[in-house]
Interface confidence: medium
């Protein structure tokens, strides 16, 4: 989590000096209760919005939007604490709006908003807006929260932002996976402008379950600079055992930008469909490995193999 | 060279829970999964699960199933096993092997001792 | 689960005797088939998978044989430090299953 830096946050508007300051997320009022506490704010929402930093680069931010309510406290508010917390890594960053001037009631609603907070693809963060004082340790709750879930990069805005361009958003693999024979299954995908090698995944299910019989990884060297963007074929022979029927080939690339955290592809070719008397199930589940002779699951033998071409 | 080096021997009591580490070295630790297999005192050899290093995949023995997790933390190139809700025959020595299915490199194993 | 019975249960047998352990199971696992072998306080050792390929570092004397359901080790010369407890896995069906065990001892 951090703020965005530029341009300079603002808070202040017409009938209100206004400054943003960073803030520890513990605000004096905690520690020194007083009397008198505004009410909460009203109508929290929060947006996703894009916004470039001073060398150009794209983010998303949460657009952090609040009223005030119509009531006297507005007389004792003294500012708002702005707070967003990182669900899944309990990651939180604080801003506070301090006013230097008394609020007024006039003839609009007071409208507050706040652009500055990046965020991150593919994650939710619980935003909350803490009006200042904040409340006496009994007293009624003067803050809202919401809850906020930032798209991931397949999102077409979210695609060309940085972060995401980064992890690799750009490439578009266009993954084809075909059941060649009882053993074999071909894999094509284009491959990106970058000399770098790829990891195929390949994790096979029995039919209608979700537990893998089966792992098996194939590492694919960097290309040339002629074959960026050409076709790759991978054919990799696999032990024909019963029941271990549908794939999902998982492609890991590794680019300069992103290393071991790039964005995944992947495809999934099905069981094949049963006959009108099919045979019947045994009731267990298969579990196979093939040997491999290029693979990473290598072993003394050269049972099944692996092996790729680009296509030009 | 290929290494598995397990946490050292544990002493519980019945109802808890034990965590025994298995540290992997020598190798591309995502590249193969990580088994586990237990044996009670002078008893055979019994399959507990398997993990992929790579997906974080399960598979657990169907008699464990609710009792047991088993963990990767990539980081440090280790797998944790973790079995809940300890009885005496529990008691075994725990060997966690590299694979998913024929287990071509065995840890030295850990002695969990369940006992009141 | 598919069940493997490993005979005899003991086997003595004097140095640089022939040795032939045997392992059966309850359904077919094709050559999905491992030998192990495991001396007291130590960590099984592997030495056959797919039922006749020898593990890194295996010496020629142990061998390995059959498919389907009946399978066999055989040590053809054994040496002192052969006597041990030999097991049986298979790894064609979940959940994985190990033979009960042979006891190979000194004659």
């Known amino acids: 989590l951090r703020l965005l830096d530029f341009p300079a946050p603002v808070c202040a508007q017409e009938g209100l000096s206004c400054r943003v300051k960073n803030s520890t997320c513990l605000d004096d009022s905690w520690i020194h209760p007083r009397n008198l506490t505004p009410s909460s704010p009203k109508d929290l929402q929060i947006q996703l919005h894009f916004a470039h930093t001073q060398q150009g680069d794209l983010f998303p931010v949460a657009h952090i939007e609040w009223t005030l309510q119509t009531d006297a406290s507005i007389l004792y508010l003294e500012g708002a604490e702005l707070s967003v917390l990182q669900l899944n890594t309990n990651e939180r960053l604080c801003v506070r709006f301090e006013f230097l001037s008394k609020l007024r009631h006039h003839h609009r609603r007071w409208r507050f908003t706040f652009s500055h907070f990046v965020v991150d693809p593919d994650q939710e963060y619980e935003v909350t807006v803490h009006h200042l004082p904040k409340p006496i340790p009994d007293g009624d709750p003067n803050h809202q929260s919401k809850n906020f879930l930032v798209p991931d990069c397949e999102h077409a805005r979210m695609k060309v932002t940085t972060p995401c361009m980064s992890s690799g958003s750009l490439w578009d693999p266009n993954i084809t996976v075909e059941t060649l024979d009882t053993q074999h299954l071909r894999v094509d995908f284009t491959l990106w402008n970058e000399s770098t090698h790829y990891q195929i995944l390949l994790t096979s299910f029995p039919h209608m379950e979700n537990h893998s019989c089966f792992e098996h990884m194939h590492h694919i060297p960097a290309p040339r600079p002629e074959e960026f963007h050409q076709r790759s074929n991978v054919t990799l022979t696999l032990r024909n055992l019963k029941g271990c029927c549908r794939h999902q080939v998982q492609i890991q690339p590794f680019f300069s930008s992103c290393l071991n955290d790039c964005l995944r592809h992947s495809a999934t070719v099905s069981c094949p469909e049963m006959p009108d008397t099919p045979e019947p199930i045994p009731d267990y589940m298969p579990l196979w490995e093939p040997r491999s002779g290029s693979s990473d699951y290598k072993d003394d033998d050269d049972k099944g193999s692996s092996h790729h071409h680009h296509h030009h | 060279q290929v290494q598995l080096v397990q946490s050292g021997a544990e002493v519980k009591k019945p109802g808890a829970s034990v965590k025994v580490s298995c540290k992997a070295s020598?190798?591309?630790?995502?590249?193969?999964?990580i088994s586990w297999v237990r044996q009670a005192p002078g008893q055979g050899l019994e399959w507990m699960g398997w993990?992929?290093?790579?997906?974080?995949?399960?598979n657990y023995a169907q008699k464990l199933q609710g009792r047991v997790t088993m963990t990767t933390d990539t980081s440090t190139s280790t797998a944790y096993m973790e079995l809940r809700s300890l009885r005496s025959d529990d008691t075994a020595v725990y060997y966690c092997?590299?694979?998913?299915?024929?287990?071509?490199?065995w840890g030295q194993g850990t002695l969990v001792t369940v006992s009141s | 689960e598919i069940v493997m019975t490993q005979s005899p249960a003991t086997l003595s047998v004097s140095p640089g005797e022939r040795a032939t352990l045997s392992c059966r199971a309850s359904?077919?696992?094709?050559?999905?088939l491992a030998w192990f072998q495991q001396k007291p306080g130590q960590a099984p050792r592997p030495l056959i998978y797919?039922?006749?390929t020898r593990a890194t570092g295996v010496p020629a004397r142990f061998s390995g044989s059959g498919s389907g359901t009946d399978f066999t080790l055989t040590i053809s010369s054994l040496q002192s430090e052969d006597f041990a407890v030999y097991y049986c896995?298979?790894?064609?069906?979940?959940?994985?299953?190990f033979g009960g065990g042979t006891k190979v001892e000194i004659k």
């Open positions: 896995q298979q790894y064609d069906n979940w959940p994985l299953t």
């Open positions: 359904q077919s696992v094709s050559s999905n």
């Open positions: 993990i992929s290093t790579y997906s974080g995949n399960t």
């Open positions: 092997a590299r694979r998913q299915l024929y287990f071509d490199y």
């Open positions: 797919d039922a006749s």
């Open positions: 020598g190798y591309t630790f995502t590249r193969y999964g």
